[in-house]
Amino acid sequence: QKYSQLLEKKTTKELVHTTLECVKKNMPVEETAWSCCPKNWKSFSSNCYFISTESASWQDSEKDCARMEAHLLVINTQEEQDFIFQNLQEESAYFVGLSDPEGQRHWQWVDQTPYNESSTFWHPREPSDPNERCVVLNFRKSPKRWGWNDVNCLGPQRSVCEMMKIHL
């Protein structure tokens, strides 16, 4: 398929991201595929990540991600989480896509990924309060480490959005 045809097809869609940064992947059968993330997003594995500098409630953060055709970060592996941590500022906290809507400690990822208690990264003594129903990534000085903390969803925090890479 010609690139011009691809472009023609793409422009019928609402353009949310006007600039993409792409990496060429050599494919079999003389085809070349491009793997892209929007400009100013971070690339890791098969996903793109946007780290906000603005603070908002969890709900507004999720909506802001949706406006960019993404969702709040869903952490699937230790490697993914470590990559994210490397790109965060230690003095800030960042909403991720994990919440407990009813305050019953039934944690849910925004994309319906099952919550697996054995692969969680809570700080010691967290989660601590059933009225704190949303999760942030934050850095604690003692011991020095990143981890998860439950907070009130209406309190403004930074956030991390995630989307699958765009393939051209």
């Epitope: 609402e14 909506k63 969803c153 209406l154 403004p156």
Partner: antibody, heavy 119, light 106 residues
Framework: QIQLVQSGPELKKPGETVKISCKAS????????MNWVKQAPGKGLKWMGW????????TYADDFKGRFAFSLETSASTAYLQISNLKNEDMATYFC????????????WGQGTTLTGSS | DIQMTQSPASLSASVGETVTITCRAS??????LAWYQQKQGKSPQLLVY???TLADGVPSRFSGSGSGTQYSLKINTLQPEDFGSYYC????????FGGGTKLEIK
């Protein structure tokens, strides 16, 4: 069960001030935003704005900036709507409505408070 | 802000009939749409959210559909208690209600 109970009907003259209350029960008050909705007699619903019950920050729709103020008494799980310098077009029924946890649609509503003008 | 155009403004139907109310948004609202029912002198009640999810306790004769800018609420086999006013509302970039549809008994 979850309830939003509003204060009773008000009879007011133009130029006066009114304060309507909305008392929440059956849930954790500071986990859900509180919205205010106006309904003029025989007319549709109009969103006025909302108050973040955790931070106290208010957001007002364009038509409700100026004479309208939202406030909270968190210890009493109560939200307030105050309208100052009342005008004839303010005579309407006012509803408080809880914003859903994730998406903010209005999952529970107060019974409404009717504001009537006296000459 | 995105505006909502609801139609029809009024509708007469008989018990047992099926009716459809539509809402058009002035921009893509990505399924961030709710439907409410309001009876005379009462507060509105949530029927549907996220365009197609029925709220708790809402009978299955109600159904929501649509995407992008076009949404509809369908009521199958109208019951006497279904008569009243219906409002759509988007919650994408703000909160805006449609003008309402008054459903009356024919």
């Amino acid at each position: 069960q979850i309830q939003l109970v509003q204060s009773g009907p008000e009879l007011k003259k133009p130029g006066e001030t009114v304060k309507i209350s909305c008392k929440a029960s059956g849930y954790s008050f500071t986990n859900y935003g509180m919205n205010w909705v106006k309904q003029a007699p025989g007319k549709g619903l109009k969103w006025m704005g909302w108050i973040n019950t955790y931070t106290g920050e208010s957001t007002y729709a364009d038509d409700f900036k100026g004479r309208f103020a939202f406030s909270l008494e968190t210890s009493a799980s109560t939200a307030y709507l105050q309208i100052s310098n009342l005008k004839n077009e303010d005579m309407a029924t006012y509803f408080c409505a809880r914003g859903d946890f994730r998406y903010y649609y209005f999952d529970y509503w107060g019974q409404g408070t009717t504001l009537t003008g006296s000459s | 802000d995105i505006q909502m155009t609801q139609s029809p403004a009024s509708l007469s139907a008989s018990v047992g009939e099926t009716v459809t109310i539509t809402c058009r948004a002035s921009g893509n609202i990505h399924n961030y749409l709710a439907w409410y029912q309001q009876k005379q002198g009462k507060s509105p009640q949530l029927l549907v959210y996220n365009a197609k999810t029925l709220a708790d306790g809402v009978p299955s004769r109600f159904s929501g559909s649509g995407s992008g800018t076009q949404y509809s609420l369908k009521i199958n086999t109208l019951q006497p208690e279904d008569f009243g006013s219906y409002y759509c509302q988007h919650f994408w970039d703000s909160w805006t209600f449609g003008g309402g549809t008054k459903l009356e008994i024919k």
